[in-house]
C-alpha cells in the first residue's frame, strides 16, 4: 500500500511569547514545529516515528496564521508519506518549538526550546475530508486540520490495491474508486483485454481483436461468420458445414453441376411431347402424333395418319388433308360406299352383309385382313408403336420391335445408358451410340475417354465453319465438326437443301 | 511446466528474409492470459523488444521494425513465428521467444533458451 | 518514442551490500514496470513484476518500488548469485520496452 498523512497547521496562539518551562522568548518565540506519526499506542511513549517524522521551517514569532504553501520550505499542508497498508488507526504528536538560530532550518540549530506539545490518538479512515481539531493549554492554542489519502494508483479503504489505468493489449480500463477495474466501452474480461465483438458474432466460428469486429475462422463467412462456405466449385448446391457441397433437387455429381433434371430445367422437348429424365443432361422426348425430331420439333405431314379409308388417297392441305374417294365411295374419309353386296365389294375372300334395308353393305374379313373391303392385309407396325426409332416387324399373327443400341423394351421405351457410370474425364460430354458411349473432350484433351492431355489444340484455329462446334478426340484428325441443321461435311463447309418430306404410305 | 524452444538456420545472407519458429510445450497457445513475443540481443548489448501475437492471430509490432517484422501463430501446432526481412549485419543477434502474462501485467515469465542468428555473406 | 534510463550502467558491490538501481521514464509511476535478472550466456528471468511483486521462487531481498518518473529494484544484501545484468522494462501504449541495463558485479 501507499498514502500520504496530511497535516494542515491553520493558526498558533502565545500571546505572551512564553516556553513550556515558563521563560519568555527574547524578543518572541520564534516558532517551528515537529511532527511524529507513529501506530496508535493507548498511552504515547517516546521512540521511532514509526509511521513517519517532519519539521517545518519557522512559520511565525509568537502567534501567527499559517497560510497553505504547496512548494518550497514551510510547504502546508505537511506530507507524511506511508508504504504500507493503512491501518485506520495513529499516534501524533506536534510540538511547536522556539529556535534562535535559522530561520530555515531550525532542527540544526542549538539552545532550541520547547513551547508547547500536543498529542493525539485515535482512528482515521482514508478520504478526502479533512478533520479539523483545535488543542489549548494554559499558554497556547493550535488550530489544525488533517487527512489521509492514497498515493497516485493506490486505491480503497486503505490504499492497498494498486491500479494504474492502460489503454494498450493488456487491457483496456479506468480504475473505479476501491480499485477496482472499469472496462472502456467495447472491453470486457478480468483485465479488460478480450474485446466485445460484433452483436451475434457466432461465438464459435467468429472472434475480433477490437471491439465491434467479426472475424471468420476458416470456412465461415457472412458478417456474422454463421454461413459456412460451400466446397470450391459447387455449382448448385449448399452446406451445413465448411466444404460441404449438398446438391440442390434435380443436380448431382461432387460439385452439384451434373443436371439429373435436365426436362425441368430446359423443357427441350416441344408440340406437347412428353419429356424423359435419364441420367445426368440426359433425357427422351416421346411425340405426340403429327410429330417427329430428337425434340418433336418437326411437323410429320397431315396425312402420316392415313385418315382416308376404302383405298381413298390422302392430299395435304395448307392445314388439313383431302381424301380423293376411289368409285363407290364418299364423305370426309371416304367412309361411305355406293356400293351394295350385288357388286361383290369384299376382296380377300371376305364375307358381304347388307345393311340399311340393302342400300349399304359391311364385309366380313378372314383373318389378317382388315378395311372396308378387307382390301389391306392386317400391319401390326401401322400405329408406329416402337419408340425411340425402333423398326417394327411383322411376324405372322404378332409383331416385334427391334431396338436401336442404347435402347430396349418390348416398344423400345427403355433407355440404355452407357454414360450411366460418367466414363469420360476431364470434364468430357458422353453421347450413347450404336458401338459404345462415345466422348466428346473439351479443348485440350483426347482420347476415347479424354484421358490423352494435347499440347496442341486442334480447335484452337477454328476449323469448323457456319457456326458448327468444334471438338477434339474423336478422330484421328484430332477434330470434329459438329454441323448445324442445313450443313454437311467435314468441316460443315456445305449446305444443303431440307430433308425430303416423309414418305406417305398408302 | 511450460517451455519455449527456438528454431531455424543459425545463418542468413544480407537482403534475405530471417524466419524463426518458437514452439511451446506444456501449455496451450490459445489459451487467453497471453501474448507471445520475440525479444533480440545483440552481441555485448540490451534487450530489445520486436514484438508479439495472440492465438487469434493479433499482432504488435516495434515500430522501429514494424515494415520489415511479420509475426504469426499456428495453434495446430502450438507454434508462432517470426519473419525479417531484408535483414542487414546489425539484426545479428541471439532472439527470444517468451510468454507475455496478462496477469503479470505483460510481465515475461518464461523464455525461450534463445538462438543465435548472424547475418553475413 | 518512450525512452527508459537505468543508472547506474555498472556497480560493483561488496556481498551483504545493499544495491538500488533507477530507472527513469515520463510518469513511469503510471505505468506497471518489471525487472529482469539476466546471467552471461542465460535467458532472463524475471524478478519484479506489477511495481513491487515477486514471482514465486524470486529471494525476499528482491524488492521494487515505482512512483512518478522512477521505478527502483533493491537487492537488500547481495549475494554472490546475484552478479548480473538487470533490466527494467514497461509497457508504452502495445510496445515493449526495455532499459539499457545495469551491470552488478561482485568486489
Known amino acids: 500500500g501507499s498514502g500520504i498523512f496530511q497535516l494542515r497547521l491553520q493558526e498558533f496562539v502565545n500571546q505572551r511569547g512564553m516556553l513550556a518551562n515558563g521563560q519568555s522568548c527574547e524578543p518572541g518565540c520564534r516558532t517551528f514545529f515537529r511532527i511524529c506519526l507513529k501506530h496508535f499506542q493507548a498511552t504515547f511513549s517516546e521512540g521511532p516515528c514509526t509511521f513517519g517524522n517532519v519539521s517545518t521551517p519557522v512559520l511565525g514569532t509568537n502567534s501567527f496564521v499559517v497560510r497553505d504553501k504547496n512548494s518550497g520550505s514551510g510547504r502546508n499542508p505537511l506530507q507524511l508519506p506511508f508504504n504500507f497498508t493503512w491501518p485506520g488507526t495513529f499516534s501524533l504528536n506536534i510540538q511547536a518549538w522556539h529556535t534562535p538560530g535559522d530561520d530555515l532550518r531550525p532542527e540544526t540549530s542549538p539552545g532550541n526550546s520547547l513551547i508547547s506539545q500536543i498529542i493525539i490518538q485515535g482512528s482515521l479512515a482514508v478520504g478526502k475530508i479533512w478533520r479539523t481539531d483545535e488543542q489549548n493549554d494554559t499558554l497556547t492554542r493550535l488550530s489544525y486540520s488533517y487527512r489521509v489519502i492514497c498515493s497516485d494508483n493506490y486505491y480503497g479503504e486503505s490504499c492497498s490495491r494498486l491500479c494504474k489505468k492502460r489503454d494498450d493489449h493488456f487491457g483496456h480500463y479506468e480504475c473505479q474508486p476501491d480499485g477496482s477495474l472499469s472496462c472502456l466501452p467495447g472491453w470486457t474480461g478480468k483485465y479488460c483485454d478480450q474485446p466485445i465483438c460484433l452483436s451475434g458474432c457466432h461465438e464459435q466460428n467468429g472472434y475480433c481483436s477490437k471491439p465491434d469486429e467479426c472475424i471468420c475462422r476458416p470456412g465461415w463467412q457472412g458478417r456474422l461468420c454463421n454461413e459456412c462456405i460451400p466446397h470450391n466449385g459447387c455449382r448448385h448446391g449448399t452446406c451445413s458445414i465448411p466444404w460441404q457441397c449438398a446438391c440442390d433437387e434435380g443436380w448431382g455429381g461432387l460439385f452439384c453441376d451434373q443436371d439429373l433434371n435436365y426436362c425441368t430445367h430446359h423443357s427441350p422437348c416441344k408440340n406437347g411431347s412428353t419429356c424423359s429424365n435419364s441420367g445426368p443432361k440426359g433425357y427422351t422426348c416421346t411425340c405426340l402424333p403429327g410429330y417427329t425430331g430428337e425434340h418433336c420439333e418437326l411437323g410429320l405431314s397431315k396425312c402420316a395418319s392415313n385418315p382416308c379409308r376404302n383405298g381413298g388417297s390422302c392430299k395435304d392441305q395448307e392445314n388439313s388433308y383431302h381424301c380423293l374417294c376411289p368409285p363407290g365411295y364418299y364423305g370426309q374419309h371416304c367412309e361411305h360406299s355406293t356400293l351394295t353386296c350385288a357388286d361383290s365389294p369384299c376382296f380377300n375372300g371376305g364375307s358381304c352383309r347388307e345393311r340399311n334395308q340393302g342400300s349399304s353393305y359391311a364385309c366380313e374379313c378372314p383373318p389378317n385382313f382388315t378395311g372396308s373391303n378387307c382390301e389391306k392385309k392386317v400391319d401390326r407396325c401401322t400405329s408406329n408403336p416402337c419408340a425411340n426409332g425402333g423398326q417394327c416387324q411383322n411376324r405372322g399373327p404378332s409383331r416385334t420391335c427391334r431396338c436401336r443400341p442404347g435402347f430396349t423394351g418390348t416398344h423400345c421405351e427403355l433407355h440404355i445408358s452407357d454414360c450411366a457410370r460418367s466414363p469420360c474425364a476431364h470434364g468430357g460430354t458422353c453421347h450413347d451410340l450404336e458401338n459404345g458411349p462415345v466422348c466428346t473432350c473439351p479443348a485440350g484433351f483426347s482420347g476415347r475417354r479424354c484421358e490423352v492431355r494435347i499440347t496442341h489444340d486442334a480447335c484452337a484455329s477454328g476449323p469448323c465453319f457456319n457456326g458448327a462446334t468444334c471438338y477434339t478426340g474423336l478422330s484421328p484428325n484430332n477434330f470434329v465438326c459438329n454441323c448445324p441443321y442445313g450443313f454437311v461435311g467435314s468441316r460443315c463447309e456445305f449446305p444443303v437443301g431440307l430433308p425430303p418430306s416423309f414418305p406417305w404410305v398408302a | 511446466e511450460v517451455q519455449l524452444q527456438e528454431s531455424g538456420p543459425g545463418l542468413v545472407k544480407p537482403g534475405e528474409t530471417l524466419s524463426l519458429t518458437c514452439t511451446v510445450s506444456g501449455g496451450s497457445i490459445s489459451s487467453s492470459s497471453y501474448y507471445w513475443g520475440w525479444i533480440r540481443q545483440a552481441p555485448g548489448k540490451g534487450l530489445e523488444w520486436i514484438g508479439d501475437?495472440?492465438?487469434?492471430?493479433?499482432?504488435y509490432y516495434n515500430p522501429s521494425l514494424k515494415s520489415r517484422v511479420t509475426i504469426s501463430v499456428d495453434t495446430s501446432k502450438n507454434q508462432f513465428y517470426l519473419k525479417l526481412s531484408s535483414v542487414r549485419a546489425e539484426d545479428t543477434a541471439v532472439y527470444y521467444c517468451a510468454r507475455e502474462d496478462v496477469i503479470l501485467r505483460g510481465g515475461s515469465d518464461y523464455w525461450g533458451q534463445g538462438t543465435l542468428v548472424t547475418v553475413s555473406s | 518514442e518512450y525512452v527508459l534510463t537505468q543508472s547506474p550502467d555498472f556497480q560493483s558491490v561488496t556481498p551483504k551490500e545493499k544495491v538500488t538501481i533507477t530507472c527513469s521514464g515520463q510518469?513511469?509511476?503510471?505505468?506497471?514496470a518489471s525487472w529482469y535478472q539476466q546471467k552471461p550466456d542465460q535467458s532472463p528471468k524475471l524478478v519484479i513484476y506489477?511495481?513491487?511483486k515477486r514471482p514465486s521462487g524470486v529471494p525476499s531481498r528482491f524488492s521494487g518500488s515505482n512512483s512518478g518518473d522512477d521505478a527502483t529494484l533493491t537487492i537488500n544484501s547481495l549475494e554472490a548469485e546475484d552478479a548480473a545484468t538487470y533490466y527494467c522494462q514497461a509497457w508504452d501504449r502495445d510496445t515493449g520496452v526495455f532499459g539499457q541495463g545495469t551491470k552488478v558485479e561482485i568486489k
Open positions: 501475437i495472440y492465438y487469434t492471430g493479433s499482432t
Open positions: 506489477e511495481d513491487s
Open positions: 510518469r513511469l509511476g503510471d505505468k506497471y
